[in-house]
Interface confidence: low
Amino acid sequence: SWMWNQFFLLEEYTGSDYQYVGKLHSDQDRGDGSLKYILSGDGAGDLFIINENTGDIQATKRLDREEKPVYILRAQAINRRTGRPVEPESEFIIKIHDINDNEPIFTKEVYTATVPEMSDVGTFVVQVTATDADDPTYGNSAKVVYSILQGQPYFSVESETGIIKTALLNMDRENREQYQVVIQAKDMGGQMGGLSGTTTVNITLTDVNDNPPRFPQSTYQFKTPESSPPGTPIGRIKASDADVGENAEIEYSITDGEGLDMFDVITDQETQEGIITVKKLLDFEKKKVYTLKVEASNPYVEPRFLYLGPFKDSATVRIVVEDVDEPPVFSKLAYILQIREDAQINTTIGSVTAQDPDAARNPVKYSVDRHTDMDRIFNIDSGNGSIFTSKLLDRETLLWHNITVIATEINNPKQSSRVPLYIKVLDVNDNAPEFAEFYETFVCEKAKADQLIQTLHAVDKDDPYSGHQFSFSLAPEAASGSNFTIQDNKDNTAGILTRKNGYNRHEMSTYLLPVVISDNDYPVQSSTGTVTVRVCACDHHGNMQSCHAEALIHPTGLSTGA
């Protein structure tokens, strides 16, 4: 049987001779050279050689456990003369014994990490890891311990885990943002003689909202013309915040001051500026200077830093309103005037007044906008604003005249204002009533006396205050011996009545009745209208059957003896 144990061989042998491994030996070996030892398997004949007479095994090269920790070989012992095995072929192991020849190596050459500024001591930052190629099962060659070479007193590292934590209170990004920490990993449990490796950890403090906004100046002054429309930007203010990003965002608001209702502040998201804008129309003559208290605040506040004070700041903004030459202002938005239609030319109707609202109180002149008075019926005294007629009026042609008066600053003609004038023309009884239509009627030959043959209506262009009251009568020249009578109905109508029984159309075919219509106003106006009455043959129902058409065709020579 074979006589050996497991072979052990120290790695990294540096001697000048071959390294002795061990001896293969069979109990059949009598020492007379009759046996021959043969080696086969991992590295046989190359890494490992055997003395075939003695069975001594030697390693020819330096071995590295980290490259190959175990070699499996086979041993044979054969009789030289017969060539037959004297022992069964047997497998054996050469185990490479570890020495501490590898330093710990970090998984990254450089680590980057972030941690919020102002973090509590002991806040986790990052974990670094180093590995050692030596045998962890034997000795302390692969037992790694972490320590900090650079980065104190700001950071610490847990020796066993490689966890880096904050070590200093109130680390302030605004003071210092970047830290370079060097960590060492040492084997042999950190003891003397251990091998070591290092890594760099670049740590950045991230921002938290630990700084309030601050105005660089306590007072700002801006100017704006009084003519600035609402929405006009008049100035920009900017508070600075040492924080960054969301934590440096600023909202502006007006918190106090007599300009609170007159101005607005809007936040420019891109520049983080507060833009002061006009909110309501300004008036230099009413108020020349406004003061505002403007506040800049962080919209996102971290409650744990409130002890540092309010996260806002305020500044005073003084706004000076500049005078702008404004147009004149009329005493009314519109004027309503009245004038009788019988007014003579140059009759004064009324007056308008306008004043320059500016401090200078520039004098104004007045004029009529000719586009609104194309017929030049009215005129104005350019100095005092008196309106007067320049043509005769007629209410019946136009009841209302709508004109525009312009007031212009004498020193600055570009400054002008306009006002509407509504002029009502009052009625005067200057029109006579007239028939509402042309009246031509007929009477039957067999008509009875006092029969109504026509109702008369009248119209009058005038418009008396108490309404129309017309009276009707036969003209004096036709009143005596007339064949017809006029009956005034006292309701602005009248009837034509027959005055006799029967008419003879052969005797008189047509009658012309002159009727006087008067109104009841002052001065009384009247007119005479003529009604034509034709005598016709009628049936027993009173329906006209025939008349002398010649009466219409040849009106000459007709009798007026109505």
Partner: antibody, heavy 119, light 107 residues
């Protein structure tokens, strides 16, 4: 939405007149002044005048006083501009436009009518 | 009439560049100024009013400024779609008047 519709083109002979239309929709027609603007080929913009659709009141650029007459038809929400005594100098694109916002700036425009004066 | 003098009449710029167009009024127009963009064959479009207020929907790269008689519009980081003619317009006094226009081309 607010729209101003104008015919695309008008071809007229020298000496004649043309009446351009601008039909408004999507807003109260009588509530906003209607403006007209001229643009000659390759040139800038010129303001012709404005009309108040409520009462027909107008403000006109003196330069166009004898050339353009502005009218409206409230029943059809349409504004008109009549151009008279046309010459080749009057060939241009004519836009109607309104100031729909709170300020005196033209924020809604018609597509424009191209007037070509040629015999 | 108030004269509006616009400059330059034309310019060419590369994508990403910033350009400035100016308008000078012949008298103080107190912020009553608008800027319009007109693309080839199209109606003008309002960009900025009240001298510096951006119309809804207009990109923030268009920036208006100025007061009194001097006004300008800056276009930051020019894009290909900014190829157009730009006009200023005063509505301070009748008749309303426009600048002569600035034609912007992209190189």
């Amino acid at each position: 939405q607010v729209q101003l519709q104008q015919p695309g083109a008008e071809l007229v002979k020298p000496g004649a007149s043309v009446k351009l239309s601008c039909k408004a929709s999507g807003y109260t027609f009588t509530g906003y002044w209607m403006h007209w603007v001229r643009q000659r080929p390759g040139q800038g913009l010129e303001w012709i005048g404005e009309i108040n659709p409520n009462n027909g009141g107008t403000n006109c650029n003196e330069q166009f006083k004898n050339k353009a007459t502005l009218t409206v038809d409230k029943s059809s929400s349409t504004a008109y501009m009549q151009l008279s005594s046309l010459t080749s100098e009057d060939s241009a694109v004519f836009y109607c436009t309104i100031s729909f916002g709170n300020y005196l700036f033209f924020d809604v425009w018609g597509a424009g009518t191209t007037v070509t004066v040629s015999s | 009439d108030i004269q509006m003098t616009q400059s330059p009449a034309s310019l060419a710029a590369s994508v990403g560049e910033t350009i400035t167009i100016t308008c000078q009024a012949s008298e103080n127009i107190y912020f009553s100024l608008a800027w319009y963009q007109q693309k080839q064959g199209k109606s003008p479009q309002l960009l900025i009013y009240n001298a510096n207020t951006l119309e809804d929907g207009v990109p923030s790269r268009f920036v208006g400024s100025g007061s009194g008689t001097q006004y300008s519009m800056k276009i930051n980081s020019i894009q290909p779609e900014d190829t157009a003619t730009y006009f200023c317009d005063q509505t301070y006094d009748f008749p309303w008047t426009f600048g002569g226009g600035t034609k912007l081309e992209i190189k």
